[in-house]
């Protein structure tokens, strides 16, 4: 069976949108009006992994691009990157663990925990125009809560 995917955008809890910053980086900033068209559209695929009522495993690809968010060790630190893949083979139901995020639903907000590195989350800074990164703390200065907006295909 083919993997199921949905197109969506994400905004952090301060309503910052995610946009491309160079070929392999995302940044978060406030957008308004026509600038909203700059925001990244994700193809969220529902993949194999540990699932519970609050937690659903997903992969986050960039729509119509062969790029996926992935989590790898760089200089011994869990790091978020955009990784290029062969579009003939992706997305797939059994994604490699580095591509898998646990989409956790709490009080109408979403967190995206790395399956590869538990307790590390897709994060944004309070500051404007800063890179989206993998953070190891919740409830601190950095933002780990998001909302999801579905986008028609």
């Amino acid at each position: 069976a083919p993997v199921r995917s949905l197109n969506c955008t994400l905004r952090d809890s301060q309503q910052k949108s995610l946009v491309m910053s160079g070929p392999y980086e995302l940044k978060a900033l406030h957008l308004q009006g026509q600038d909203m068209e700059q925001q990244v559209v994700f193809s969220m695929s529902f993949v194999q992994g540990e699932e519970s009522n609050d937690k659903i495993p997903v992969a986050l690809g960039l729509k119509e691009k062969n790029l996926y968010l992935s989590c790898v060790l760089k200089d011994d630190k869990p790091t978020l990157q955009l990784e290029s893949v062969d579009p003939k083979n992706y997305p797939k139901k059994k994604m490699e663990k580095r591509f898998v995020f646990n989409k956790i639903e709490i009080n109408n907000k979403l967190e995206f925990e790395s399956a590869q590195f538990p307790n590390w989350y897709i994060s944004t800074s309070q500051a404007e125009n800063m890179p989206v990164f993998l953070g190891g703390t919740k409830g601190g200065q950095d933002i780990t809560d998001f909302t999801m907006q579905f986008v028609s295909s």
Epitope: A1, R4, L6, F46, Q48, E51, N53, D54, I56, K103, E105
Partner: nanobody, 123 residues
Framework: EVQLLESGGGLVQPGGSLRLSCAAS????????MGWVRQAPGKGLEWVSS????????YYADSVKGRFTISRDDSKNTLYLQMNSLRAEDTAVYYC????????????????WGQGTLVTVSS
């Protein structure tokens, strides 16, 4: 043509048990995640349970966890739901769903569903 035919519903007393079946045809059953959703009188659809294509992963709504068991027999193209310790609030039409994928706590995607079987829990 995909067909899903549920059976096994009926009237049962609180605390009783029922086993629902769903006979599937028209697609390669073993390749697909399957599941059950239900609709209580006057309410919306509620996800009940899912089982992975291999049958090695099962998922349950909190409201039925520990009471219901989902299973599948790929040799018979059949999905099952064993319902124990039934309660009045389990009264609903139960639908079998093909390629059921849960996308959030209260949202699902599925390709096909059957006509349903009515379960009534009452004394």
């Amino acid at each position: 043509e995909v067909q899903l035919l549920e059976s096994g519903g009926g009237l049962v007393q609180p605390g009783g048990s029922l086993r629902l079946s769903c006979a599937a045809s028209g697609f390669t059953f073993e390749d697909y995640q399957m599941g059950w959703v239900r609709q209580a009188p006057g309410k919306g659809l509620e996800w009940v349970s899912s089982i992975s294509a291999m049958g090695n992963r099962t998922y349950y709504a909190d409201s039925v966890k520990g009471r219901f068991t989902i299973s599948r027999d790929d040799s018979k193209n059949t999905l099952y739901l064993q319902m124990n310790s039934l309660r009045a609030e389990d009264t609903a039409v139960y639908y079998c769903a093909e390629n059921l994928v849960r996308i959030s706590k209260k949202q699902w995607m599925f390709d096909y569903w059957g006509q349903g079987t009515l379960v009534t829990v009452s004394s």
